[in-house]
């Protein structure tokens, strides 16, 4: 949940309590376990070569 008193994150981003800022949901493909990814609708799977080069 976003910290009280902070502006809502823009579309395609989600609040990270760990980093104390809005983060791009697109980065959840690379960092799926980041706290802010819970606030993103769906983290697309990484392409095969990115996960298993």
């Amino acid at each position: 949940e976003q910290a009280p008193g902070t502006a809502p994150c823009s579309r395609g981003s989600s609040w990270s309590a760990d980093l104390d800022k809005c983060m791009d949901c697109a980065s959840c493909r690379a960092r799926p376990h980041s706290d802010f990814c819970q606030g993103c609708a769906a983290a697309p799977p990484a392409p095969f070569r990115l996960l298993w080069p």
Epitope: G12, C25, A26, S27, R29, A30, R31, H33, P44, L50
Partner: antibody
Framework: EVKLEESGGGLVQPGGSMKLSCVAS????????MSWVRQSPEKGLEWLAE??????????HYAESVKGKFTISRDDSKSRLYLQMNNLRAENTGIYYC??????????WGQGTTLTVSS | DIVLTQSPASLTVSLGQRATISCRAS??????????MQWYQQRPGQPPKLLIK???NLDSGVPARFSGSGSGTDFTLNIHPVEEEDAATYYC?????????FGGGTKLEIK
Amino acid sequence: EVKLEESGGGLVQPGGSMKLSCVASGFTFNNYWMSWVRQSPEKGLEWLAEIRLKSDNYATHYAESVKGKFTISRDDSKSRLYLQMNNLRAENTGIYYCTGGFADYFDYWGQGTTLTVSS
Amino acid sequence: DIVLTQSPASLTVSLGQRATISCRASQSVSTSSYSYMQWYQQRPGQPPKLLIKYATNLDSGVPARFSGSGSGTDFTLNIHPVEEEDAATYYCQHSWEIPYTFGGGTKLEIK
């Protein structure tokens, strides 16, 4: 203030080795993917190697051109990144940048260190 | 490897006008939701600086006169209105897969 400072560049003969270092400050080093990027007039910007996090078992990835020749490593306790380069050739000449990114982009860049491979 | 082709190689734009730089990828770097394309600015004697990530998202501290668009294989960086300090070389970079690659650069001059 974020700072990345490379060192270890210089002149080396073909076939020689060199180890580059980068010391980081101003951000949570152990939470950032780190990479080395080279720039040369001939090939422009080239991503060379990446090392991920402790939680990723420090997974490494390399460009095909340096695989088996270069080794990337990190020491989170010292906020340091390294690049061991062996069997250097003239085409390895360039400016080597230490870069850091939260994910698959490069947020932070050092000023670069120049490597010249020449006899 | 994915090849990124930038155009034009160089351009000159009058102060206050619009600069448009294109980057074409040899294959799609987009999902249905996101595009894995970044833009960087490099001033002479300086390292590159991240401007835009994931095709459209301005990095913190980057002026709103910079904008990115595109998906699939075709991406665009727009600068409007152009200021003197924007004279630099601009690079695109994909993060669709390993290896990451960069475009050849576009040199922007201001008149």
